[in-house]
Amino acid sequence: RKIPKVGHTFFQKPESCPPVPGGSMKLDIGIINENQRVSMSRNIESRSTSPWNYTVTWDPNRYPSEVVQAQCRNLGCINAQGKEDISMNSVPIQQETLVVRRKHQGCSVSFQLEKVLVTVGCTCVTPVIHHVQ
Amino acid sequence: GITIPRNPGCPNSEDKNFPRTVMVNLNIHNRNTNTNPKRSSDYYNRSTSPWNLHRNEDPERYPSVIWEAKCRHLGCINADGNVDYHMNSVPIQQEILVLRREPPHCPNSFRLEKILVSVGCTCVTPIVHHVA
């Protein structure tokens, strides 16, 4: 899957673009908005009717090296009495993000962009029921 | 920076950390090509905290299309199909990395950018306080 070229309908390529070898692109990994602090709702993973836990995956050959994944705690959902209701389903909600993968081939190093699917949390859904004959 | 394990036989001149700027292959390695959440599942309709998906498009960014979730209700859908306002539909937000064309409009020069997206909604039981 290649990154699409800039469409002529939007704009012409400026003269100031840096020269890039064919088949590759220049990537600055100094992240824009790196230090912005986001106020995410506290403890929603514990207060949700489809609660989840977080685990951190760490890979030194990936940038960023730390990726947090969520796992639903239950198969069913938590009802008003605090009990699991298995007539409902806790299901993962997923989102793609980009990472940079560093590959070692002998003593040379190459970099590859990779899409990673991250589970961000869980939601409670009504299952679609089929009765098998 | 991030420390990288190195082949012990390699020269020591190699930097252990990710450099600030790298040349990257144009092909993105992935098996998850379906970026339209409406096609990947119908959870957004079947959830007790259902959401609508809004298309956010920016040609200066890769991916150029990102889908943003907005919870349909303040409360959650109960067993009778009515909204229960003693519960909350809350967006699940996630910081993701995208590519921003830098300098602008350049076809093969990018910078990583961190953005906050609402991916879906979940139903939350709030802790209740009565204000004196």
Epitope: - | L74, V90, V124, P126, V128, H129
Partner: nanobody
Framework: DVQLVESGGGLVQPGGSLRLSCAAS????????MGWFRQAPGKEREFVAG????????EYADSVKGRFTISRDNSKNTVYLQMNSLRPEDTAVYYC?????????WGQGTLVTVSS
């Protein structure tokens, strides 16, 4: 701590109007939504109207749609409920709610009486 100051209740004739307001102060950051519930004598507390802070999305109970309008002032952390064409069945204690997603604060209530 969080404080909620409700005002605007009172006695009004059928067909008349009132405007309730509720100002949140203290640690009222990251507001999810604010709104109003009501409780009539001998009845359960019911949702009336709410407004989401992020995008001003509004929701109303069927019984008040077209008559009541909820609005907000972000800079003042204040929510308003404009109540028109009031009916005797709107008589109740109206409670302001401040919702922070995982924590919800209830005000002490303001009495609205619709009577001739």
């Amino acid at each position: 701590d969080v404080q909620l100051v409700e005002s605007g209740g009172g006695l009004v004739q059928p067909g008349g109007s009132l405007r309730l307001s509720c100002a949140a102060s203290g640690r009222a950051s990251s507001i999810n939504w604010m709104g109003w519930f009501r409780q009539a004598p001998g009845k359960e507390r019911e949702f009336v109207a709410g407004i989401r802070w992020s995008d001003a999305y509004t929701e109303y109970a069927d019984s008040v749609k077209g008559r009541f309008t909820i609005s907000r002032d972000n800079s003042k952390n204040t929510v308003y409920l404009q109540m028109n064409s009031l009916r005797p069945e709107d008589t109740a204690v109206y409670y302001c709610v401040l919702d922070l997603s995982t924590v919800r604060y209830w005000g002490q209530g303001t009495l609205v009486t619709v009577s001739s």
